[in-house]
Each structure stands twice: as structure tokens, then as C-alpha cells.
């Protein structure tokens, strides 16, 4: 799994846009089975916040044991706390489930910082505010962990929604979503609307607040505005995509587009930040610093270590630039762009000092494992993980935080040549390349 404020462990060659309009596929295409526009029972089924992750309620076992489970598109294991831990209010008790089956196999998942390990089994799983189905799924019962569970996060497990290729211990362990699609009539697609609050939430506020929606098996048209634009899933392991151009306030970073995807670019709801490869991060920060130079910030702010606080109500959003990522489109030589605001990449944090300050951390950070479009990106958009058609859709989220002057955007089409050259081909060595 990716790392660096990676939850749960964790806190180009593109040409300039041209006037030429290319045909595009949006939701004008025929509706497919299961893609009806309203999924009332699933709307608002997520809670949480970007810094600690978004979670959905799930039940495991017979009789059902209710747990809150982190929604993570950057991993592929369904793993739940199965032993007492100081940060867990509750945990999966296998001995109380009549439907639990032991697979007599262990699993060990190390991260750059921390790890979890456990025992593999299967049990009956359902999602109360999801499709009305029960599936037998693989479950890693976490018996030991280090720096995995987050104090006060209110989740007790993780739902890895990516593909089998990155499942642990190996790709033979079927991920939950594969099991769901195989055993039911749920279409092979899910969509996420993560709603950042725009201000820090204390524990009781998180419990009371809506964090967003995970629509399993379809698209809910009430959760977005405008059109959905799709980018191909380059390879089915992580949700890998290709970025072809990056702009800060409309100014092209002018880097070889391979740099943007070195060594990959993924969409990951389990990572807090927008994480960028070192060279790209440095160029982006230089550009953001220049745009916001009317204010002086400590170096630690740009490293994500230090918060800055404005008098409550006076955050100068206007001095910070918008950031646009151009993604490969579905049509040859066509791209589209997603644009986020500082309201997404400045993450509100509780200041211990005073409630009369609005404090933020810079939520763009450096990565050694490629670009990670984490919660700060996803909070601007409704994101459709269309596994059936091997593509990811983006539309402006109906719940994104903005001001009266600017809004997040999804726009296209733009003519961009040689986009295939933007992808980086990771040298194939052994399986240890997945160890991060």
C-alpha cells in the first residue's frame, strides 16, 4: 500500500488546450443495468474526515457484528481489528460467529512506518447502508498492529477496494468487491463522494456529521454537478491513471509528463494528501509559493509539518492558486482537466491554542512512489470507479468546499498528443516491488 500521509498509517507532453471540440462520452450514453440515478439508501453512508479517513458501517458474521470500516481505494484487503487494542471501541470476535471459516493462513502487511498482521478467514459480510445483499468474503482478522489504527478515528478496519494484484499475501486472495460482484447482481462499479468539512471537526462533530457517500453498484446524479469525464484505468492493480499536464493558476509546470506519473499515478481514498513525485512536488511548491508570496510562511508549512493560522473568518483564499491536473481522456489525443482550490489542498486542523483561529496544514506532499490523488483531491469531486469499463470518472462534487469567487471544476475536452508516452513502465522485478 502507498505511504506517506497514508491512511490508515499514514495522517507533460500535453499540448496547450485548443479550441477544437472533440466528441466525448459522458452520462448522455445509454444507462446500463444498475446505473439508475438514485441510490437513496446509500447516500450519506460515510463519516469521517480527510485527515483520519472516511468509513462505512459494515456487519460481519452471524449474528452480525457491526464495525466501522475505512474505505480505501489504495489497497485490496478487507482487514478488521480482531483483538483488543487501546484505539478500538470494538473488534471482530470470530468465536462469536457461527459462519466464520478459518483459512489457516497468516497475513503480514508492513508499511514504511508501522504494520498489521493477522489470520485469514472468510465470513458473511453486508453493508447496512449499501446494497441489500450478503456475501461471503475473505477477512484478515488483525491480531497485531503498529501505527495502524488511529486514536479517535472511529473505524475498526479497512476495506481495500483496489484489485487482486496488490492483495496480501498474494493475488489469489479475492478482494471484497470482486466477491460482491461475483456472488450478487451488483454491477462492477462503485462511486465515492468524500465531503471535506472545510473546518476542523471535533470527535462529536465527526460522529454527527455526514462525511459523504459510497454508492455501490452505480452512480447517483444528485451527488455531482455538470458532466462526468472518464480517464482510463491504465492497469488493474491500484486504480492507476495517467496525468498528462499540470497547471498552477493556469500556468503549465512544463515538465516531461512522464515525471507526473513516476513511477505511477493512483486514486487513493486512504491517503490524506495530494502526493507528488519529488521533482513535481518541488516545481509545484515553487509555483504555489510564488503565487502566494504576499504572505510569508515557514519552511515547515510547505513540508506539511507546521500549521499556519489566520484570524477566524479571514483566511485569504484568494492568494492561493488553483491546481489543475489534466488526465488522459477516453478518446485518442483528448484529455480533460480537474481543478482543485486551496479549500481542498489546505487541510483544516484543530489548533490547540484558540477557537478564534482558522488553522491549516499544507496537504500536498512529496512522494517516492508516484502521484497519489488522495482525499484532498477526491473531496473536490464525485469519483466513479467504473471497473466494468476499466475507467474512472470525475465530476464536480455537490458537496465540495469553495467560495463565492472560485469553484472546483472538471472541464474538457483538450487536445493532447502522445499521451501514452506519459505513462511510466515500472521495471518488473520480483514481488518485493510492492513492499513500500
Amino acid at each position: 500500500t502507498q505511504h506517506g500521509i497514508r491512511l490508515p498509517l499514514r495522517s507533460g507532453l500535453g499540448g496547450a488546450p485548443l479550441g477544437l471540440r472533440l466528441p466525448r462520452e459522458t452520462d448522455e450514453e445509454p444507462e446500463e443495468p444498475g446505473r439508475r440515478g438514485s441510490f437513496v439508501e446509500m447516500v450519506d453512508n460515510l463519516r469521517g474526515k480527510s485527515g483520519q479517513g472516511y468509513y462505512v458501517e459494515m456487519t460481519v458474521g452471524s449474528p452480525p457484528q457491526t464495525l466501522n470500516i475505512l474505505v480505501d481505494t489504495g489497497s485490496s484487503n478487507f482487514a478488521v481489528g480482531a483483538a483488543p487494542h487501546p484505539f478500538l471501541h470494538r473488534y471482530y470476535q470470530r468465536q462469536l460467529s457461527s459462519t466464520y471459516r478459518d483459512l489457516r493462513k497468516g497475513v503480514y502487511v508492513p508499511y514504511t512506518q508501522g504494520k498489521w498482521e493477522g489470520e485469514l478467514g472468510t465470513d458473511l459480510v453486508s453493508i447496512p447502508h449499501g446494497p441489500n445483499v450478503t456475501v461471503r468474503a475473505n477477512i484478515a482478522a488483525i491480531t497485531e498492529s503498529d501505527k495502524f489504527f488511529i486514536n479517535g478515528s472511529n473505524w475498526e478496519g479497512i476495506l481495500g477496494l483496489a484489485y487482486a494484484e496488490i492483495a496480501r499475501p498474494d493475488d489469489s486472495l479475492e478482494p471484497f468487491f470482486d466477491s460482491l460482484v461475483k456472488q450478487t447482481h451488483v454491477p462492477n462499479l462503485f462511486s465515492l463522494q468524500l465531503c471535506g468539512a472545510g473546518f476542523p471537526l471535533n470527535q462529536s462533530e465527526v460522529l454527527a456529521s455526514v462525511g459523504g457517500s459510497m454508492i455501490i453498484g452505480g452512480i447517483d446524479h444528485s451527488l455531482y454537478t455538470g458532466s462526468l469525464w472518464y480517464t482510463p484505468i491504465r492497469r488493474e492493480w491500484y486504480y492507476e491513471v495517467i496525468i498528462v499536464r499540470v497547471e498552477i493558476n493556469g500556468q503549465d509546470l512544463k515538465m516531461d509528463c512522464k515525471e507526473y506519473n513516476y513511477d505511477k499515478s493512483i486514486v487513493d481514498s486512504g491517503t490524506t494528501n495530494l502526493r507528488l513525485p519529488k521533482k513535481v512536488f518541488e516545481a509545484a511548491v515553487k509555483s504555489i509559493k510564488a503565487a502566494s508570496s504576499t504572505e510569508k510562511f515557514p519552511d515547515g508549512f510547505w513540508l506539511g509539518e507546521q500549521l499556519v493560522c489566520w484570524q477566524a473568518g479571514t483566511t485569504p483564499w484568494n492568494i492561493f492558486p488553483v491546481i489543475s491536473l489534466y488526465l488522459m481522456g477516453e478518446v485518442t489525443n483528448q484529455s480533460f482537466r480537474i481543478t482543485i482550490l486551496p479549500q481542498q489542498y489546505l487541510r483544516p486542523v484543530e489548533d490547540v491554542a484558540t477557537s478564534q483561529d482558522d488553522c491549516y496544514k499544507f496537504a500536498i506532499s512529496q512522494s517516492s512512489t508516484g502521484t497519489v490523488m488522495g482525499a484532498v483531491i477526491m473531496e473536490g469531486f464525485y469519483v466513479v470507479f467504473d471497473r466494468a469499463r476499466k475507467r474512472i470518472g470525475f465530476a464536480v462534487s455537490a458537496c465540495h468546499v469553495h467560495d463565492e469567487f472560485r469553484t472546483a471544476a472538471v472541464e474538457g475536452p483538450f487536445v493532447t498528443l502522445d499521451m501514452e508516452d506519459c505513462g511510466y513502465n515500472i521495471p518488473q522485478t520480483d514481488e518485493s516491488t510492492l513492499m513500500t
Epitope: 484570524q311 477566524a312 473568518g313 491554542a353 478564534q356
Partner: antibody
């Protein structure tokens, strides 16, 4: 030019009330918080608290809760410090200071108002 | 409360000298430190904030440095007008506290 102009010196008796004004100019008053700092004769600087000039909400340091009150007259770009039930220990120079933009450093200061409490 | 200790109450110097005034915090204040200069009968003037950022109009002979708990204000070449009282202040958490001050005087 940014300026913070404080009211003149005050001579008060114990038990009385004093109200000091701090009139600002040269910037948007409601964008920057206003801090109050006490300096007793021959002593160092002590942070009394601050007031959010956008919301009007005051924050007091523990040692100054109870008898001190910060207020605003936004239309006049003026902040006020009132100290009730004065004691001899309140004899000091009081400074208003504009809080910095991104943190609580104090970038511009008034000239200070000396308050003497004596029976 | 975070305590700031300026170990030298007085420092003697000569015009043209390089002088360093130190400030130690009782806990890590993550470079949230400011420095002020105060002359007799005047209000303090901000010199440095965020440990090393020079305030508008402050001569470049004044530099701030440090991290964690240890911070320094350096005057590269002392001028006669620099003889004054210098205070450090932490803007990390409430209550925002000041050091006891260091008086820079002529030898």
C-alpha cells in the same frame, strides 16, 4: 502607513475602572486580530489575550480573566481594553499590537498607555 | 505554559561586533518564534517571526535561526542604534509567552 494610536496616560484609584483605546489606520481593521500586552514598570512583556476583529470574540490569558475586557468599535477601526476594579498591581504600560497574519506574532504596536493605580 | 529563557540578562558589545542572543523554550515550539527590540520609553518593534523571517524594513544585519527548543537572534555588525532590550516570544501556543529579555549594552 500602518499606525496604532493609543489613548493617553491614566491615573486611577484602586477599585476604579479604566478604558484604553487603540485607534488603527493604514490597513483593513477586521483582517488582523488585536492583541493586548502588559508591561509592569521595569519588567518584561506579558500577553493578556486578543480579540478577533472579524467576529468580535475575545480570548483572555488565564491571569487576565475576570477583570479585563476587550471590545471593538469596528466602524471607527478602534479596539478597547477595559480593566475593572483596579488594583495597585495593575500599574503598568499597556500596549495594543496587531497580530501577524499567519500566527500570533505582533507586527505593529501602539505607543503604549501608562496606567497608574494609586490611592 | 511554555517558558522562554533568555540566559543572558545583559550582553556587552562594541560597535561593529557580531553578537548572538539566545532563547531556549521549555518545549519544542516548531520555529514559531519572534524577536522584538525595545528601546527605553518606546513600544517593542518586531524584528523576526517564524524564527527566521525578517519583518518589513528590518535591516539585514538582523538574522534569526533555530529549531526545536533553541533559537538565536544574530546581529552581524552591531550599530549604536541597536543598543536596546531584545525579547523572544513563542507564537506556537497560548498563552503566547515572552522571554525575560536581554539588554544589549556597550562594553
Amino acid at each position: 502607513e500602518i499606525q496604532l494610536q493609543q489613548s493617553g496616560p491614566e491615573l486611577k484609584k484602586p477599585g476604579e475602572t479604566v478604558k484604553i483605546s487603540c485607534k488603527t489606520s493604514g490597513y483593513t481593521f477586521t483582517t488582523y486580530g488585536m492583541t493586548w500586552v502588559k508591561q509592569a514598570p521595569g519588567k518584561g512583556l506579558k500577553w493578556m489575550g486578543w480579540i478577533n476583529t472579524y467576529s468580535g470574540v475575545p480570548i483572555y490569558a488565564d491571569d487576565f480573566k475576570g477583570r479585563s475586557a476587550f471590545s471593538l468599535e469596528t466602524s471607527a477601526s478602534t479596539a478597547y481594553l477595559q480593566i475593572n476594579n483596579l488594583e495597585n498591581e495593575d500599574t503598568a504600560t499597556y500596549f495594543c499590537a496587531r497580530r501577524g497574519s499567519t500566527a500570533h506574532y505582533f507586527d505593529y504596536w501602539g505607543q503604549g498607555t501608562t496606567v497608574t493605580v494609586s490611592s | 505554559d511554555i517558558v522562554l529563557t533568555q540566559s543572558h540578562k545583559f550582553m556587552s558589545t562594541s560597535v561593529g561586533d557580531r553578537v548572538s542572543i539566545t532563547c531556549k523554550a521549555s518545549q519544542d515550539v516548531s520555529t514559531a518564534v519572534a524577536w522584538y527590540q525595545q528601546k527605553p520609553g518606546q513600544s517593542p518593534k518586531l524584528l523576526i517571526y517564524w524564527a527566521s523571517t525578517r519583518h518589513t524594513g528590518v535591516p539585514d544585519r538582523f538574522t534569526g535561526s533555530g529549531s526545536g527548543t533553541d533559537y538565536t537572534l544574530t546581529i552581524s555588525s552591531v550599530q549604536a542604534e541597536d543598543l536596546a532590550l531584545y525579547y523572544c516570544q513563542q507564537h506556537y501556543s497560548t498563552p503566547y509567552t515572552f522571554g525575560g529579555g536581554t539588554k544589549l549594552e556597550l562594553k
